[in-house]
Structures are given as C-alpha cells and as structure tokens.
C-alpha cells in the first residue's frame, strides 16, 4: 500500500457562512516541514501555497476573496512533505449568504415560554425557495432544515432551559447559497429555580472551533522539543 502522511485539519476562520462579496479564509493545518499545501474545491485544485520556511510553519491560510455562489461548496486540503503526500482532509462546506432576500422568523406561542411548553419556529420567505434553515447563535454547526413553499415550520417539542438563546433563519436556494439572515428571535425559557440556575446559557461569540490555530515554530520551541525527547530517552 502507498504510504501517506496523516490528514490535515481544514477550518474556516471566523465562520463557514460568508456574506457574498466578502472574503472567506480557510486554514489547512498540516505539519512542520510541509513544502506545499493544496486546497481542493468540489474535487478540483483551487489554490496552492508553499510556506516559507516550511520547517517553521505547521499550516497555511487560503484566502477566497469576493465570495459568490461559484465559490460556495465543498473544500478539502492536502499537504506534501518531500515527495510524500498526505491523506485528504475532511470536507468543509463553505456557504455564501446574503443572497436575494431576507426571511422573517417568528415563534409560537411567543418568545417567552415555560419549560415543558411546545414551541414552533416559523420561517417565511416569499421568493422561490423550498428549503429553510434554523440556526441557534453560538451553535452554527447545528443547522435544522425544514421544507415548504413559502414558509417552513420548526417544531421544537417541549422545551427546556437549554433551548434558551437567539435564533435566526435562512432561506436556501441550494445547499451552499443562503438568503440574508432573518432578524434574530430571542427565546426565553423559564423553569423552576433549580433548573434555571443549573442551565448553562449558550455563548453568543462565534463557534470556538471556527478559528485557525496555525503556529510558527521558534528556535526555543525546537530546543524544548529536543530537550523533552532527550529527557524521555534518559528516563527509559
């Protein structure tokens, strides 16, 4: 079997949902010593980067300016050390937003409910679309999908304090082209004091995994690594 290097990690910097005409940044984290990184889009080569100096950098950033529906889709990356290529990263779905129109999000019976009540969100968009998406702020990976000609409903069932938070919806023209986001709807779920005090509220900052953790190796890091390796050998 052909030998390959471990697969790199691909991430979107800040978010995978990019407003049209704005810039997307994708990070490919591979290995120190990688001489070339390649970004692939829908199976075809999209961009190449050769880090300098390769032994000091463990990944690269790929910049995608002027985001549009032609650049929205599935991305992956690979890297090369010498003549040896890595396995392909997992796929990352890059979505273009702010296409066409803005939907309206409402909630029934209302934005303030009691724990155990049944809640349904309604997302409405008059322009031709059949798929709607509901996202909770701070949890943008947990996308709920629903279908309807002009309006879709998102039944939440009996809610708990864990459902508290801010929600937005999108109309989707295909999997990777979404409308403008709706205005947010804040769901407030009250429960008994015991539940309320224990229920963690969701963070409102962007998803913590949507950050690029690329590092530049310094001489000191190298010395520490060498020292650690020597110490491990002495301990054996």
């Amino acid at each position: 079997p052909k030998q390959t290097l471990p697969k790199p990690i691909i991430r979107a910097e800040s978010t995978y949902m990019v407003p049209k005409e704005k810039q997307a940044t994708l990070c490919c984290q591979g290995s120190y010593g990688a001489v070339e990184y390649q970004l692939h889009f829908e199976g075809s080569l999209f961009a190449v980067e050769r880090p300098k100096p390769p032994e000091r950098i463990n990944g690269v950033k790929f910049h995608i300016p002027d985001m549009n529906s032609r650049k929205a889709g599935r991305y992956s990356c690979i890297y090369r050390v010498g003549e040896l290529w890595s396995e392909r990263s997992d796929l990352l779905d890059l979505v273009v937003t702010e296409m066409y129109d803005t939907p309206t999000l409402s909630v029934h019976p209302g934005p303030e409910v009691t724990s155990g009540e049944k809640v349904t969100f309604y997302c409405r968009l008059d322009t031709a679309t059949s798929m709607f998406l509901l996202l909770k702020e701070g949890r943008s990976r947990d996308v709920q999908r629903s279908y309807g000609k002009v309006q879709a409903e998102f039944p939440m069932g009996p809610v708990t304090t864990a459902h508290r938070g801010s929600y937005r919806c999108f109309g989707s023209y295909n999997n990777y082209a979404w409308s403008f986001p709706s205005e947010p709807v804040k769901l407030l779920v009250t429960g008994d004091i015991e539940n309320t005090s224990l229920a963690p509220t969701d963070p409102t900052f962007p998803d913590s995994w949507d950050t690029c953790l690329l590092t530049r190796e310094t001489g000191l890091q190298k010395d520490l690594a060498l020292w650690d390796h020597t110490a491990q050998n002495l301990l054996r």
Epitope: A47, K52, P65
Partner: nanobody, 119 residues
Framework: EVQLVESGGSLRLSCAAS????????MGWFRQAPGKEREFVAA???????YYADSVKGRFTISRDNAKNTVYLQMSSLRAEDTAVYYC????????????????????WGQGTLVTVKP
C-alpha cells in the same frame, strides 16, 4: 488580437492591468481551445511563486513586473495543441502567497488573445 506562430517556435504574451492594486493581486493565464472548456495554464502569487499545468510545464514561464503592472507568459516549443484563446486573469485583493488554479477564484478577466500554432 491574433498571434500566428510556427510549431516549435516561441511567443510572449503580456497583460497590462490598470489600477494600483496590481501588486496585491495574484495573476493567472487560462486558455480555451475551439470546442473545449477553458483550462488553467499558469499562475503566479504576489511573491512570485508559480504553478503550471502539467501540459505546459518546462515549456511556458509566467512572470510579473509590478512596476509596469504587467504579467507575462513566455511560451516556447509551441505545439499545434497549444492553439487557443489565451486569457489573463486576476484575483483582487489577495493576502499571503496563495497561487490560484481554479477559474472560479478569479474575479477580473482580460478579453483574450488568439494564439494559432501552425503545424
């Protein structure tokens, strides 16, 4: 514009860009042969890193002159199958040293020049 050249001959294409963002642009050359899809030829990053299609590697050279806002494609050992309309393109703005290979990455395009290689 039409360029006629003998098989085995050489030719240099140039593409001048307007505006002062040229130095921060990544540039590329693409070509489209009659009845075929547009294909990638060569690209150059802001820092002069280059990438070539396998079909032109060793025969074509891409370069840029930021002072003249111009990108060049030096073509040698030309073959009949190199006959196509050649387009220059730019990705503006870019950061870092990305070399762009996919046509979807490019947001500015030249009008094209026909290169005919006589067998």
């Amino acid at each position: 514009e039409v360029q006629l050249v003998e098989s085995g001959g050489s030719l240099r294409l140039s593409c001048a860009a307007s505006g002062r963002t040229f130095a921060s642009a990544a540039m590329g050359w693409f070509r489209q042969a009659p009845g075929k899809e547009r294909e990638f030829v060569a690209a150059i990053s802001r820092s002069d890193d280059t990438y070539y299609a396998d079909s032109v590697k060793g025969r074509f050279t891409i370069s840029r002159d930021n002072a003249k806002n111009t990108v060049y494609l030096q073509m040698s050992s030309l073959r009949a199958e190199d006959t196509a309309v050649y387009y220059c393109a730019a990705v503006v703005p870019t950061y870092g040293n990305n070399i762009y290979v996919h046509s979807a990455a490019y947001n500015y395009w030249g009008q094209g020049t026909l290169v005919t290689v006589k067998p």
